[in-house]
Interface confidence: low
């Protein structure tokens, strides 16, 4: 069974001017074949954090017109269109401001549904 987790780690050597906060745990999604899913990484920090995406511990690679991630006002958003069952997995975002690191993990489950288009 896939069990979603959220975790965060902060190094002990902090600049008093710097901070990094996981504002909200990542959402979990259960959806159907062919649908679109959005995972949100909600972090804030100073300096502005670098955010990376991983699926099952592997870096996520953007796919033209299907899978993309982009910076948002709240952190980063990962969007996957035309979902396939192979998209099921743990998705983790890792954010760093150069001194601290926070991460959150959510689960995307793509199921065979009654209301989807077969390819």
């Amino acid at each position: 069974e896939l069990v979603p987790t959220s975790s965060w780690n902060i190094s002990s050597e902090l600049n008093k001017d710097s901070y990094l906060t996981l504002d909200e745990p990542m959402n979990n999604i259960t959806t159907s074949l062919g649908q679109t899913a959005e995972l949100h990484c909600k972090v804030s920090g100073n300096p502005p954090p670098t955010i990376r995406w991983f699926k099952n511990d592997a870096p996520v690679v953007q796919e033209p017109r299907r899978l993309s991630f982009r910076s948002t006002i709240y952190g980063s958003r990962l969007r996957i269109r035309n979902l396939d069952t192979t998209d099921t997995g743990y998705f983790q975002c890792v954010a760093t401001n150069g001194k601290e690191v926070v991460s959150s993990t959510g689960v995307l489950f793509v199921k065979f549904g009654h209301h989807h288009h077969h390819h």
Partner: antibody, heavy 122, light 107 residues
Framework: QVQLVQSGAEVKKPGASVKVSCKAS????????MHWVRQAPGQGLEWMGI????????SYAQKFQGRVTMTRDTSTSTVYMELSSLRSEDTAVYYC???????????????WGQGTTVTVSS | AIQMTQSPSSLSASVGDRVTITCRAS??????LAWYQQKPGKAPKLLIY???SLQSGVPSRFSGSGSGTDFTLTISSLQPEDFATYYC?????????FGQGTRLEIK
């Protein structure tokens, strides 16, 4: 000292495959992601992909999908990059480059191998 | 893919000069930019990361600035060992991409 040592130069014929090795020393091999970057003669730098030496997971640039395979051997602290179906445009210096950060990735490179020249010629 | 464009492609300067190289991204890369120095027959060397952070061991005459789409690498007083080719690289999104390089030559 901390270093990456790559295998020697290769000459290959079009259609063949090449496997380049990169041996890490002086640091904990499994704590740092490894990238491969290539540079054609007189040209700029081109990122090929990344491997997590701990779990072996990989991500490849779309341009190389289906032709490149990155693997690792933790017992020897070595990563490998194999490129198949070689063509003349693959003639380049191939570098392994360590990711800047341990366990989370910064996607920039603080340690480079010396480079391996691969020549593809009939 | 994000395109990185450096200017100038080459420049000539003298020891002691102040030199600025620019790098422009085709879309916003925030501060996710690095600069490298490469000498002939050698691997690149990291100079600057996160647009303005100096890599450990790199002389303080090197500095970086910028965010979003426009970035600069400045060498405050050129030394003989600084003549090389310089590359910018964005690490905001896949695929990682580099500028075409700026060749710095002795005048």
């Amino acid at each position: 000292q901390v270093q990456l040592v790559q295998s020697g130069a290769e000459v290959k014929k079009p259609g063949a495959s090449v496997k380049v090795s990169c041996k890490a020393s002086g640091y904990t091999f499994t704590n740092y992601y490894m990238h491969w970057v290539r540079q054609a003669p007189g040209q700029g730098l081109e990122w090929m992909g990344i491997i997590n030496p701990s779990g072996g997971s990989t991500s490849y640039a779309q341009k190389f999908q289906g032709r490149v395979t990155m693997t690792r051997d933790t017992s020897t602290s070595t990563v490998y990059m194999e490129l198949s179906s070689l063509r003349s445009e693959d003639t380049a210096v191939y570098y392994c480059a360590r990711d800047s950060s341990s366990w989370y990735s910064g996607w920039y490179f603080d340690l480079w191998g010396q480079g391996t020249t691969v020549t593809v010629s009939s | 893919a994000i395109q990185m464009t450096q200017s100038p492609s080459s420049l000539s300067a003298s020891v002691g000069d102040r030199v600025t190289i620019t790098c422009r991204a085709s879309q916003d890369v925030r501060a996710h930019l690095a600069w490298y120095q490469q000498k002939p027959g050698k691997a690149p060397k990291l100079l600057i990361y996160a647009a303005s952070s100096l890599q450990s061991g790199v002389p303080s005459r090197f500095s970086g600035s910028g965010s979003g789409t426009d970035f600069t690498l400045t060498i405050s007083s050129l030394q003989p060992e600084d003549f090389a080719t310089y590359y910018c690289q964005q690490f905001n999104s896949y695929p990682i991409t580099f500028g075409q390089g700026t060749r710095l030559e002795i005048k």
